[in-house]
Interface confidence: low
């Protein structure tokens, strides 16, 4: 048999809180336990579900959990079934609701001296107790013509008067908790002795020296009083006015007129109405003085034809907000079309050249008007006034290539030489009108030149070839002074270039003809065997038909070229001894000898006491030291010729003689015999 060890029992439960209906069974075989609510099987949900044999409630819900629960145990093998005792919840709850008018049926029917009943729609179980409030203040029974019972949900005002006007709310509490009205009720019972607003003053904005009018009206029975105050609570009347409101007038209907408004009149004006009974009504309005600031400047604008562009006008700060409009040629722009105003923007659609000009943004309010001009340029593609022409430019002279164009705005011109941009330097200069100047034309300037003229609307370009007209010149110019070696063959070249290949000939400066052993072969003067008489002044003459002739003068000297009679040798000297480096040279003119030691010329006037250069050219160094070691170069030179020869100098320590060495033992290497420099010890 199936036996219930624990049966569910009826119990108190709180709305929205946890609960558990217990059920435990004992049976010989396996049993299946399920629950019924009002005879229908209970399905598990997240809120309500079987927990073992018991039924668990995560949050009791008044509508869903009201009814009779029963636990059923069934043996599916034998078919035996047992049911528990019935159990139900006593659910405690409270739910907020509005304050509503119960009597009379509508607000329109509320009159002074009628009975008014309000109901508090807060419900709960157990039945809550109620508390009423007017304007947040609790109401108690028997006070000021109203009936209220904490057990009753109604508030009765009998009779209702103006003193009952206000915002009514209610709260209720029970064992479960507390709730207050979700919507309150405003009771308005007019008292004709209270001041009521008929006309409220509005904020005004006026220009300096203009007039301002504030309207203000109240009604009451008997008629209410009306008073105006300004800012610092100073009353304004026609009899006594503060000094800065000398031009104020209060009319019988309550309106306040201010004439010739000044800055000090700006501020808050208060209109106060007071009935025979009730609180004063204070209405405020502000007088603003109109103002308008300056407008920012526009940058000039450049647009291209066919494009759409916009120019925004930033309105100046001002009160009231300034209105903004655009004008062109004294005419206000429309709000649609090809050139029109949209908001604060000037819009130019499909721009035409004729749209160029000055456009003016205007801003205005009561305080005045501001304007700012914007200059609009419509860019055009440049057109040619003068293209660059193929040109012949003379070498060595300035050359000019024109690139004259016109456009709006003024076009910028750049030049290219062999497709490379020409940057202005000492040789090239681009003038404001686009002309290129080559300061000193050179042969290699003969090439292609291209100029490009541009505006934002587009660019044009043209090219021209430059041919350089070479000047007649020696290439290279002959050296003005040249030497020839006596008794040897010699040549003196002279070559020149020009627009036409020039003819070149040599002559002696004195006009005498060249001897037969001297030939002039296409500009090269050839001496078969130089004699002393060949010395002298010669002139090379280059000439052609178109350019005439040019001359170069050359002084030829006949010389015996330098040869060394004696050359310095590799020399090794003991430290402290004297080194002699010999050098003798011959030639005509007689050569001069200079020495170079360790990469610097030895100046005979600054040699110091240890060094000396003899008349014949030999160099002597006394009391040699290791730092004198190095390469020494003998340089022989005259007006025609220069030759050099070099040898190293080694300075070594003198070895100390050993016992085994005899007095005649040779040094370990060959020494140049020099004189020992004796030191005298005092």
């Amino acid at each position: 048999a199936i036996v219930f060890i624990k049966q569910p029992s009826s119990q108190d439960a709180l709305q929205g809180r946890r609960a558990l209906l217990r059920c435990e069974v004992e049976a010989p075989g396996p049993v299946h336990v399920y629950w019924l609510l009002d005879g229908a099987p209970v399905q598990d949900t997240e809120r309500r579900f079987a927990q073992g044999s018991s039924l668990s409630f995560a949050a009791v819900d008044r509508p869903q959990d009201s009814g009779t629960f029963q636990c059923v145990a069934r043996d599916d093998v034998t078919g035996e079934e047992a049911r528990s005792a019935n159990a139900s919840f006593n659910i405690k709850w409270i739910e907020a609701g509005p304050v509503v008018l119960k009597h009379p049926a509508s607000e329109a029917e509320i009159q002074p001296q009628t009975q008014v009943t309000l109901r508090c729609h807060i419900d709960g179980h157990p039945r809550p107790t109620y508390q009423w409030f007017r304007d947040g203040t609790p109401l108690s029974d028997g006070q000021s013509n109203h009936t209220v019972s904490s057990k009753e949900r109604n508030l009765t005002l009998r009779p209702a008067g103006p003193e009952h006007s206000g915002l009514y709310s209610c709260c209720a509490h029970s064992a479960f908790g507390q709730a207050c009205s979700s919507q309150n009720f405003t009771l308005s019972i007019a008292d004709e002795s209270f001041a009521r607003v008929v006309l409220a003053p509005q904020d005004v904005v006026v220009a300096r020296y203009e007039e301002a009018m504030f309207h203000c009206q109240f009604s009451a029975q008997p008629p209410p009083s009306l008073q105006w105050l300004f800012e610092d609570e100073t009353p304004i009347t026609n009899r006594s006015r503060p000094p800065h409101l000398r031009r104020a007038t209060v009319f019988a209907n309550g309106s306040l007129l201010l004439t010739q408004v000044r800055p000090r009149n700006a501020g808050i004006y208060r209109c106060i109405g007071q009935g025979q009974r009730g609180p004063p009504i204070i209405l405020e309005a502000t007088l603003h003085l109109a103002e308008i600031e300056d407008m920012p400047l526009f940058e000039p604008r450049v647009f291209t034809a066919g494009s759409e562009e916009r120019v925004t006008c930033l309105p100046p700060k001002g009160l009231p907000e300034p209105s903004v409009w655009w004008e062109h040629a004294g005419v206000r722009l429309p709000t649609h079309g090809r050139v029109y105003q949209k908001g604060h923007e000037l819009v130019l659609a499909n721009i035409a050249e004729s749209d160029a000009g000055v456009y003016t943004c205007h801003a205005a309010n009561l305080a005045g008007q501001r304007r700012q001009d914007v200059n609009i340029t419509v860019a055009t593609v440049p057109s040619w006034l003068k293209k660059p022409q193929d040109s012949q430019l003379e070498e060595g002279k300035p050359g000019y290539l024109d690139c004259l164009t016109q456009a709006t705005p003024k076009p910028t011109v750049v030049w290219y030489r062999n497709q490379m941009l020409i940057s202005e330097d000492s040789r090239f200069e681009v003038f404001k009108n686009g002309t290129l100047r080559i300061n000193s034309v050179e042969v290699y300037d003969g090439t292609w030149y291209r100029c490009m003229s541009s505006t934002p609307a587009g660019s044009i370009e043209a090219q021209a070839r430059v041919q350089v007209l070479e000047k007649l010149k020696f290439t290279p110019p002959p050296q003005p002074q040249q030497c020839m070696e006596f008794d040897k063959e010699a040549t003196v070249p002279c070559s020149a270039t020009g627009r036409e290949k020039p003819t070149i000939k040599w002559e002696r400066a004195d006009g005498s003809s060249l001897p037969e052993w001297v030939t002039d072969n296409a500009g090269t003067l050839h001496f078969a065997r130089v004699t002393r008489d060949d010395a002298g002044n010669y002139t090379c003459i280059a000439s052609n038909g178109p350019q005439g002739q040019i001359r170069a003068h050359v002084q030829l000297t006949v010389a015996v070229f330098i040869t060394f009679k004696v050359e310095p040798e590799r020399t090794t000297v003991y430290q402290g001894h004297t080194a002699l480096l010999q050098c003798e040279a011959q030639g005509d003119p007689k050569p001069l000898i200079q020495w170079k030691g360790k990469d610097r010329i030895l100046d005979p006037t600054k040699l110091g006491p240890r060094m000396h250069i003899f008349q014949n050219g030999s160099l002597v160094i006394h009391d040699v030291a290791p730092e004198d070691s190095g390469r020494y170069t003998c340089i022989a030179g005259n007006s025609c010729n220069i030759k050099h020869t070099e040898a190293p100098l080694y300075v070594v320590d003198k070895p100390v003689p050993e016992e085994s060495e005899g007095p005649g033992s040779p040094p370990p290497y060959k020494m140049i015999q020099t004189h020992h420099h004796h030191h005298h010890h005092h």
Epitope: R208, E231, D232, P263, R264, I292, E293, D294, Q369
Partner: antibody
Framework: QVTLKESGPGILKPSQTLSLTCSFS??????????VGWIRQPSGKGLEWLAH???????YYNPSLKSQLTISKDTSRNQVFLKITSVDTEDTATYYC????????????WGQGTLVTVSA | DIKMTQSPSSMYASLGERVTITCKAS??????LNWFQQKPGKSPKTLIY???RLLDGVPSRFSGSGSGQDYSLTISSLDYEDMGIYYC?????????FGAGTKLELK
């Protein structure tokens, strides 16, 4: 841009009349809300307001000097004038011309000032 | 006449320091008060108009505040360029009146 420049006699003797001219550019006294005034500053001392004239010829004077002061304008020539009669050594000061824009910044623009010395 | 009392009459401050100069009117002048800066041998320059509005081009380290009778000029972080004499001006009523000035020098 807005510029104002004062000009005056430099030196004058007590009891003479001081005539000052303010020449301005960058705005017009025919524009509503524009005004020009005069302020002076004795060397090493503070600033003293003298007079003001508005675009509509409304004029205001410092009451302490009112009987000596006359302010006027020539709108077409962009000039404002100030006359001070019966000057004394105490009127030695730098005189500044200033622009006001009613409902915007009063004295936003100042001239460089002109030094007037009253000496016997 | 409205009397403007400026304080302090002179002060020393260090670079980067926050500096405040005050001006008290003998009656309510709100909001009609300007602040000026004057450097030796130069014309005064307007910094602030209508109590708290910065004139175009004036560095944002300058600010003005106040209402009724009490007004102040504040330099949030003193710069070498800010040395000079500062004046306040009321333009609520004619005659217009200036404060006596505050000389600001480098400490």
């Amino acid at each position: 841009q807005v510029t104002l420049k004062e000009s005056g006699p430099g030196i004058l003797k007590p009891s003479q009349t001081l005539s000052l001219t303010c020449s301005f550019s960058g705005f017009s006294l025919s524009t509503s809300n524009m005004g020009v005034g005069w302020i002076r500053q004795p060397s090493g001392k503070g600033l003293e307001w003298l007079a003001h004239i508005w675009w509509d010829d409304d004029k205001y004077y410092n009451p302490s000097l009112k009987s000596q002061l006359t302010i006027s304008k020539d709108t077409s020539r962009n000039q404002v004038f100030l006359k001070i009669t019966s000057v004394d050594t105490e009127d030695t000061a730098t005189y500044y011309c200033v622009r006001s824009n009613y409902g915007y910044a009063w004295f936003a623009y100042w001239g460089q000032g002109t030094l007037v010395t009253v000496s016997a | 006449d409205i009397k403007m009392t400026q304080s302090p009459s002179s002060m020393y401050a260090s670079l980067g320091e926050r500096v405040t100069i005050t001006c008290k009117a003998s009656q309510d002048i709100y909001p009609y008060l300007n602040w000026f800066q004057q450097k030796p041998g130069k014309s005064p320059k307007t910094l602030i108009y209508r109590t708290n509005r910065l004139l175009d081009g004036v560095p944002s380290r300058f600010s003005g505040s106040g209402s009724g009778q009490d007004y102040s000029l504040t330099i949030s972080s003193l710069d070498y360029e800010d040395m000079g004499i500062y004046y306040c001006l009321q333009y609520d009523e004619f005659p217009l009146t200036f404060g006596a000035g505050t000389k600001l020098e480098l400490k």
